[in-house]
Structures are given as structure tokens and as C-alpha cells.
């Protein structure tokens, strides 16, 4: 089971020192600030989830050495920052979506023996992304996202 | 096969300085995620928590003991070191190493999986 | 500092009972407390992170449940080798702290 936490109850203050290691900011409707670095150095888990988010300023994640899962579910992302895809040892929870091609290449030419990388479709089953992404973003097809047509994996 | 390994002078006297290593095998503090705390236990009472250090040389400490508290590793020999100054009577305990490893799978979590067997430290004058 | 409050200080129970210890945070520390055991003259040992994920070998008889503040191990079918001391440790906030332990005695 993953760990999991409680989010803040009041409004979100960037400029607040967060020093627990787990931080829970799901379904806030946040929009994250460009220039501004999330300050959480202790941080192991950051929960993101359902935030509407399209963009990952890639200055909001540049002090979080400690980060090791990103859960970024139920944002309609359109890419994934080559900075933050490069962090090899980061685990990026995220619905399949045609925008993960860049983190998923990034990751295959800079991160050697890495276990596989999965996918989220609407349904919460975990698929390959690379399998998705062969079936669903070859060129020419239309910008997809998790559909439950490939196959599961537990 | 993991495991840590506590030595310590056994006993010092008031006022000096008690330094401990932790000597480990089966992982390297190297890779990301991976570290190790010190922990100490008072004959008869609970577990307290002294610091801790991380892969990358990031160390973290009791804001209780922080003053007298000094972290440093060797990465090359797998080694761990603490020095606690000024040392009193209430540091008698026995002292533990601890590793926090990294998940392959799930990360996020965090405890220590395995511990030293302790070694036990008395100040008396 | 989060303040964990271990209960009760100790209890004797009989081979084949079943055993509850309970751990209480002073604040809201998610899923993030360990279990360990310590028998006599031992060092502490593992038995449950993230307050329900049994840890590798540990019998399936321990288990751990809760979150936020309230945190429950349970032993379902206590036996004699489980005669320790029972620890746990939030790990969501530094300092890191630990309750003060229950002792298990078998009658």
C-alpha cells in the first residue's frame, strides 16, 4: 500500500517551508507558480492529483532531492517538463496521455536499468507505457489518453 | 546480505567526546534514496532518534542534541560516523544504526529495515 | 515534536489470544508509523511500515492498521515468541519519534 497523508487545510502559501515527508495538495485547483521552487527538502512523496494542471514549471520541482514519487493523476498534462523526466530515480504517477512521449524517451536515453515505466488509464488500471504509447500515439493518430483497450497490468 | 555494525569506546567520562562508527555491508549509501539514522535506547526506556544522513551528504538531526551532534560518512569503506560532545550521564545508552533503504517498488516510504545490533556507551566519571 | 503515546505500558496475555497495542500521534502524521519488535538484549526489528504493510518474512498472524492519528498492531494468535517489546515511530515529520513501548508478557 502506498503511504499516504492529509492535505494542508488551509490555502496553500508558496512561500511556506514545508517540512513534513509526505505533502498532499490533491484536488485543490492549484496552479503552480512559474519561477518560484516548491520548498520541501524532506519531501519523499508529492501528491499533485487532480489539479487541472497542463504545465510543470520545471522551477516548482528544482529543490525537491528527496522526491521519489510525483503523483500527478487526473491533471490533463500536455508535456512533461525533460528536466523533471530526467530525474531517473523519480516515480511519475500519470494518466496515459500521448504527452508522456517526452518522458518516456528522456527516460530511455538517460536512465539505464530502470524498471518499466507504467501508465494510469480512466479505470485506475496501471498499463506499459511504452505499450500505450505504440498503440495509441503512433503518427498519424489523434491525441489519446487511457481508454482501458490495452492490456492490464497488476 | 544486509547488515550494520555499531562500535563505540564503551566508556567515556563527562565532558568528552563520545564518537561511534557504523561499518555496513550489502548496499551503498550511494544509491539515491539510501540512508542511515542513529538511534539510541536508555537501559529500560524507549528509542530516540539522533540523526540521519542521506546519499547525498544531506544530514538531518534531533534539534534537541543539534548543538553537540556532528555527522559525517565515508562512502568508499561503508562507513558511518557520529560524535556527540560534552557527553553527560543521560547519554548512557545503548546506540543503534539503522538503514533507511530506497523501495524499488512504491517509493515514499520510510523506515529502517535493518539495524545494528547496538553498542552500549556509559558515562561515568 | 510529534508526541507518540503508546498504550497500554504492558499486558500478559495467553498463548493463542489475541493481542491489540495502540499508538497515538499528537498531530496528523498520515500513514507514516512503524511497528518493531525488541526481544530481550536484541536489537529492534521491523514488523510493519506504513502503518498496514506487513514487512518481508514477518508472520501474517502481526498486523498493523491506521492513519492520521490513531495507529493499531494487532496479534491475532499470540505466541510464546512473541514475548518483545513493541515499538512505534512516526517518520512523516522531523525529529522522527518513537512511543515509549509496550511490553508483551505470556502468562
Known amino acids: 500500500q502506498e503511504p499516504s497523508c492529509t492535505m494542508p487545510s488551509t490555502d496553500v502559501d508558496w512561500n511556506t517551508e514545508f517540512s513534513a515527508t509526505c505533502l498532499n495538495f490533491s484536488g485543490r485547483g492549484l496552479s503552480l507558480p512559474l519561477n518560484q521552487s516548491l520548498r520541501a527538502s524532506n519531501v519523499l512523496l508529492l501528491d499533485l492529483s487532480g489539479n487541472g494542471l497542463r504545465e510543470l514549471p520545471v522551477t516548482f520541482f528544482a529543490h525537491l532531492q528527496k522526491l521519489e514519487v510525483l503523483n500527478l493523476l487526473h491533471n490533463p498534462l500536455s508535456r512533461v517538463d525533460g528536466a523533471l523526466a530526467a530525474r531517473c530515480d523519480l516515480d511519475l504517477r500519470a494518466d496515459c496521455s500521448c504527452a508522456l512521449e517526452s518522458w518516456h524517451e528522456v527516460r530511455r536515453d538517460n536512465c539505464s536499468g530502470q524498471k518499466p515505466l507504467l501508465c494510469w488509464d480512466t479505470t485506475s488500471f496501471q498499463h506499459n507505457l511504452s505499450a500505450f504509447l505504440e498503440v495509441s500515439c503512433a503518427p498519424g493518430l489523434a491525441p489519446a489518453t487511457g481508454s482501458g483497450h490495452h492490456h492490464h497490468h497488476h | 546480505q544486509v547488515t550494520l555494525k555499531e562500535s563505540g569506546p564503551g566508556i567515556l567520562q563527562p565532558s568528552q567526546t563520545l564518537s561511534l562508527t557504523c561499518s555496513f555491508s550489502g548496499f551503498s549509501l550511494s544509491t539515491s534514496g539510501m540512508g542511515v539514522s542513529w538511534i539510541r535506547q536508555p537501559s529500560g526506556k524507549g528509542l530516540e532518534w539522533l540523526a540521519h544522513?542521506?546519499?547525498?551528504?544531506?544530514?538531518r538531526y534531533n534539534p534537541s542534541l543539534k548543538s553537540r551532534l556532528t555527522l559525517s560518512k565515508d562512502t568508499s569503506s561503508n562507513q558511518v560516523f557520529l560524535k556527540i560532545t560534552s557527553v553527560d550521564t543521560a547519554d548512557t545508552a545503548t546506540y543503534y544504526c539503522a538503514r533507511r533503504p530506497r523501495d524499488y517498488y512504491g517509493g515514499g516510504h520510510w523506515y529502517f529495515d535493518v539495524w545494528g545490533a547496538g553498542t552500549t556507551v556509559t558515562v561515568s566519571s | 515534536d510529534i508526541v507518540m503515546t503508546q498504550s497500554p505500558k504492558s499486558m500478559s496475555m495467553s498463548v493463542g489470544e489475541r493481542v491489540t497495542l495502540t499508538c497515538k500521534a499528537s498531530e496528523n502524521v498520515g500513514t507514516y508509523v512503524s511497528w518493531y519488535q525488541q526481544k530481550a538484549e536484541q536489537s529492534p526489528k521491523l514488523l510493519i511500515y506504513g502503518a498496514s504493510n506487513r514487512y518481508t518474512g514477518v508472520p501474517d498472524r502481526f498486523t498493523g492498521s491506521g492513519s492520521a492519528t490513531d495507529f493499531t498492531l494487532t496479534i491475532s494468535n499470540v505466541q510464546t515468541e512473541d514475548l518483545a517489546d513493541y515499538h512505534c515511530?512516526?517518520?512523516?515529520?522531523?525529529?522522527?519519534?518513537f512511543g515509549s513501548g509496550t511490553k508483551l508478557e505470556i502468562k
Open positions: 515511530g512516526q517518520s512523516y515529520s522531523y525529529p522522527f519519534t
Open positions: 544522513i542521506y546519499w547525498d551528504d544531506d544530514k
